[in-house]
């Protein structure tokens, strides 16, 4: 019968021929009367056989990632009779893996959005690299992830590629971050190959800023002939948040005379000071009112940022009109 060993050939061998193994029949007594033949895909081109000894050689450089095994057939013939000594038999030559492929991130580009001020440990995104080497062959395709850029705000779990927040971030200081992740095979041991990917992490806004008046003091004038409803001037606050979180409402906090009102222009986010009652120069020609501004929408859990509304003082001078 046939005497079988497992046949392996390392990929990417640079030698012109590499001894793979030997076909042998237990009837072969070594007197050179047997002729060994190799048949099948790769026979004669990738693999050759010494017909007298049965030694098989690989004569081409192999790439396991292209083809990981070859199924060949073996024959042995008695030269003197021309008959088969053994029944034709199928056998396998496996291409053994070497670490010749670096990890690759196939889902690039990566982009994630996470709310600003998210707590430490918040999951941002998972990145995954793949390595074309043999996962069952040592550590050639066993990957470890690490952070090359993004400290101290982000961390990556070494074995999963899960990116998490490691420090709170304020969108108003910086609204996006580029994180660079490296994947190394050989679980990071010497000789490891690596690949990198960039992740764009954008911070979405939360309402962590209250509106604040641009001026702590305003000066307006109103003619004593102005009818009620007259707009006598505008006041303005700013809010470092964006979108809905920056929408604000102005109101009167203090006006003993109850002469003025403030309405909000929601398009410009300005407060418009309105004359609510007609003024009389002879009766009162100087007014002082206090206005306040608050956000239109505030989540319950963000109330700590909005405890005290910003206020401003408005001095209003009445201009005399000569009466006939």
């Amino acid at each position: 019968g046939w005497v079988w060993n497992q046949f392996f050939v390392p990929e990417e061998m640079n030698t012109t021929s590499h001894h793979v193994g030997r076909l042998r029949s237990d009837l072969d007594n070594g007197n050179n009367s047997f002729q060994y033949k190799l048949l099948g895909a790769g026979a004669g081109s990738t693999f050759i056989i010494d017909e007298r000894t049965g030694d098989i050689y690989a004569i081409e450089k192999l790439d396991r990632e292209e083809r990981s095994l070859y199924i060949l057939r073996a024959q042995v013939i008695d030269i003197t009779t021309g008959r088969a000594v053994e029944p034709e038999s199928e056998f396998v030559i496996k291409v053994s893996d070497i670490n010749d492929n670096e990890p690759k991130f196939l889902d690039e580009p990566y982009e994630a959005i996470v709310p600003e001020m998210s707590p430490e440990g918040t999951l941002v995104i998972q990145v995954t690299a793949s390595d074309a080497d043999d996962p069952s062959s040592g550590n050639n395709a066993r990957l470890l992830y690490s952070l090359l850029q993004g400290q101290p705000y982000f961390s990556v779990e070494p074995t999963t590629g899960v990116i998490r927040i490691s420090s709170k971030m304020d969108r108003e200081l910086q609204d996006e971050y580029w994180v660079i992740i490296q994947a190394k095979d050989m679980i990071g041991q010497p000789g490891a190959l690596s690949g990198t990917t960039s992740v764009l992490i954008k911070l979405s806004d939360v309402n962590d800023n209250k509106p604040i008046f641009k001026e702590s003091l305003y000066r307006l004038t109103v003619s004593e002939s102005a009818p009620t409803g007259t707009s006598i001037g505008t006041i303005m606050a700013y809010d470092n948040d964006i979108g809905e979180n920056a929408e604000m409402d102005y109101s009167i906090e203090e006006d003993d005379s109850q002469t003025f009102d403030i309405i909000t222009n929601h398009e410009t986010q300005e407060g418009i000071v309105i004359l609510k009652k007609k003024v009389n120069f002879e009766h009162q020609n100087h007014y002082g009112i206090r206005a306040k501004v608050k956000n239109h929408h505030v989540d319950e859990q963000l109330m700590k940022y909005h405890t005290e509304a910003s206020t401003t003082f408005i001095k209003i001078q009445v201009e005399d009109v000569d009466e006939p």
Epitope: E215, S216, L217, Y218, R219, T221, E254, D256, S257, E282, H283, Q284, N285, H286, Y287, G288, R290, F313, K315
Partner: antibody, heavy 120, light 107 residues
């Protein structure tokens, strides 16, 4: 801290024009919302407001003195000035310059005052 | 114009006593438009109270203001030696007028 300093002649002849200047330091005369006033106090008597000016040049005067008073401002020098024409002995007083407050028209900052005597 | 009348003209008290100074307006004014000043000889007036009960920066809490309509009061809870001076009220709603002053002197 805003500081104000009055300067000008201490003696003015009757029927002439009294001229005083107030120099502001520690803050800008162009600060939004603040008015700059002149107030006087005849010897041994009470306080009388003369008038104020805003940095834009808009002024408002005490009706009883309006015909004789001019207040002007020079933002480049951080100064404002008082001119009171046709003076008489009744205009003899300590003249103060002052700035109003951040929460009303009260007088928060005052100069130390300068005595102007009207006499021939 | 609004006339402010202060009373008494002179108040003679000892250190440690309570001083109550009155200011009456010739017509109603909003309490937000009244201030009190202290003046010592040879010095400029110093703002004490405005609006009518807010203390100016650096003013001790023994000074307090109250009132509404036409009647306003400045109270010094316990007179200190440095409190003996002339006190003026001022309204700043209809132009600017001052009371004639109340002198607080040592008894």
């Amino acid at each position: 801290q805003v500081q104000l300093q009055e300067s000008g002649p201490g003696l003015v002849k009757p029927s002439e024009t009294l001229s005083l200047t107030c120099t502001v330091s520690g803050g800008s005369i162009s600060s939004s919302g603040y008015y700059w006033s002149w107030i006087r106090q005849p010897p041994g008597k009470g306080l009388e407001w003369i008038g104020y000016i805003y940095y834009t040049g808009s002024a408002y005067y005490n009706p009883s003195l309006k015909s004789r008073v001019t207040i002007s401002v020079d933002t480049s020098k951080n100064q404002f000035s008082l001119k009171l024409s046709s003076v008489t002995a009744a205009d003899t007083a300590v003249y103060y310059c002052a700035r109003d407050g951040s929460s009303g028209w009260y007088f928060q900052y005052w100069g130390q005052g300068t005595l102007v005597t009207v006499s021939s | 114009e609004i006339v402010l009348t202060q009373s008494p003209g002179t108040l003679s008290l000892s250190p440690g006593e309570r001083a109550t100074l009155s200011c009456r307006a010739s017509r109603q004014i909003s309490s937000s438009y009244l201030a009190w000043y202290q003046q010592k000889p040879g010095q400029a007036p110093r703002l004490l109270i405005y609006g009518p009960s807010s203390r100016a920066t650096g003013i001790p809490d023994r000074f307090s203001g109250s009132g509404s309509g036409t009647d306003f009061t400045l109270t010094i809870s316990r007179l200190e030696p440095e409190d003996f001076a002339v006190y003026y009220c001022q309204q700043y709603g209809s132009s600017f007028t001052f009371g004639q002053g109340t002198k607080v002197d040592i008894k």
